[in-house]
């Protein structure tokens, strides 16, 4: 930009160096030469002279508009052509933003993720401001009224040694730019509620070489929560369609989870947990590919034909996956899979 | 209960600096986020800066590059660094709690003056 620029004269903008984007603009550039009676004041944006919409107002003073100015950064300066110079004379530059009033942020959400030490809080920011947009967390003890804020850019981490003086508290997100100040919904939040047990893995696959063969997994966590509430999900990388089983884990133990397969196909497994009857989940754990032993008997086993698990099941749901196309999102979950519902949301998914 | 008391302020010409300083009492200052604001003559409160118990900060465009937010903890004390000043920036300061608004609560403020 055009911060230290020496003026020999000045520049302004209406209805400001920072405007909402689709705004007219008047630009003026006024002269302070010595020695210089301009013949011309000329206007240039990002380096290249503007041709139109220039007018002169008096000897020392000329304005630029722009209709519906729509670049959300832009470098201007003027300069003078003095009689018997060469070269133009620079008089003047700013650099000019436009853009948005931030929207309210919504879909706040906050998680302790287990050990972490921290409450993590995100929230959607809406539609892009292209300005600098700053978001102030409020966190407020429903016990002791006192009030904490935190600056952030798009997500905060807050120490749960700050919040050391109650389990209760109101959260909301203020967002704050040059062009205006929205808040979220408030939050109610128990420190309790919002735990999401530690990492979930799947450690290890194998088939056995029964009549009937049976795939195993098995799967663990570091998670010191005692009732643990986990969902399964699996399909083999041909197919677009999840099963997914449910369990209630004690994980002072490894899991083990067996499944009767199609034969000869490569299956891709993931696990998720939350603390049984919370709200939040892990995200999916990474998938897991497992490839299944060649058929020894002729029965063509079909997934959720036969569901044996060895822990406490319920239902198997049907899932449809989305494109394959979609990037690995690792972003907390909120939702959980309804039985039979398709998969939408938040949901991370693997083709 | 909450006490805050600022100074630092005086007579500058333009594209001078100036500290100002603001020394806290009566709460749990390092969890607190501060800001400061200002009121000039014939007009009304604007807010100026703020900085969360972080060390995190947020300025307002027309101060934005030339002053500067901090806190010590140690101390108990909120400062504005006012560099590159301008006659549109005398004002009375005053700091208060929370990193953003137009308000204060009954501070004295400082006198920034800013003049040739």
């Known amino acids: 930009g055009i911060t230290s620029i020496n003026c020999s004269g000045d520049m302004w903008v209406e209805p400001g160096e920072i405007f909402q984007m689709g705004m007219n603009v008047s630009i003026y550039c006024q002269e302070a030469l010595k020695h210089c009676r301009p013949r011309n004041l000329y206007f240039y944006k990002n380096g290249f002279k503007e041709e139109f919409d220039i007018t002169r107002i008096n000897r020392t003073t000329a304005r630029i508009w722009y209709k519906g100015f729509s670049e959300p950064h832009a470098y201007m300066h003027c300069t003078a052509e003095c009689p018997g110079h060469f070269q133009e004379t620079l008089i003047c530059g700013k650099d000019i933003s436009s853009g948005h009033p931030p929207d309210a942020p919504s879909n706040l959400t906050c998680v302790i993720y287990e050990y972490s030490g921290n409450m993590t809080c995100t929230w959607n920011t809406g539609k892009p401001t292209y300005i600098d947009t700053k978001y102030i967390v409020h966190v407020k003890s429903l016990e002791t009224e006192e009030e904490q804020q935190y600056l952030a850019s798009s997500y905060v981490k807050i120490s749960t040694d700050s919040l050391q003086g109650s389990r209760k508290y109101l959260v909301w997100v203020q967002a704050v730019n040059s062009l205006g100040m929205e808040n979220s919904q408030q939050l109610h939040v128990h420190l309790d509620d919002i735990v999401i047990p530690s990492a979930s893995i799947i450690s290890r696959a194998e088939t056995t070489n029964d009549t009937v063969p049976k795939t195993i997994v098995y799967w663990k966590s570091k998670t010191m929560i005692e009732k643990v509430f986990c969902e399964m999900r699996y399909k083999t990388t041909t197919n677009q369609t999840w099963s997914v089983k449910e369990f209630d884990a004690n994980f002072t133990y490894v899991q083990q989870s067996e499944f009767y397969l199609e034969p000869d196909s490569k299956y891709v497994f993931q696990v998720r947990c939350q603390e049984t009857g919370k709200r939040n989940w892990q995200p999916w754990s990474s998938p897991f590919v497992h490839q299944t032993s060649q058929e020894t008997g002729k029965r063509n086993w079909q997934p959720w034909s036969s569901p044996f698990v060895h822990q406490t099941s319920q239902t198997v749901s049907q899932v449809t996956a989305k494109s394959s196309h979609e990037p690995q999102k690792m972003e907390m979950l909120s939702a959980t899979i309804f039985r039979g519902h398709p998969a939408s949301g938040n949901h991370q998914d693997i083709g | 209960q909450v006490q805050l008391q600022e100074s630092g302020g005086g007579l500058v010409q333009p594209g001078g600096s100036l500290r100002l300083s603001c020394a806290a009492s009566g709460f749990t200052f390092r969890l607190t986020a501060m800001r400061w604001v200002r009121q000039a003559p014939g007009k009304g409160l604007e807010w100026v800066s703020g900085?969360?118990?972080?060390?995190?900060?947020i300025y307002a465009d027309s101060v934005k590059g030339r002053f500067t937010i901090s806190k010590d903890n140690a101390k108990n004390t909120l400062y504005l660094q006012l560099n590159s000043l301008k006659t549109e920036d005398t004002a009375m300061y005053y700091c208060?709690?929370?990193?953003?608004?137009?308000?204060?609560?009954g501070s004295l403020g400082t006198q920034v003056t800013v003049s040739s």
């Open positions: 900085i969360d118990s972080r060390g995190s900060t």
């Open positions: 208060a709690q929370g990193v953003y608004g137009d308000t204060y609560s």
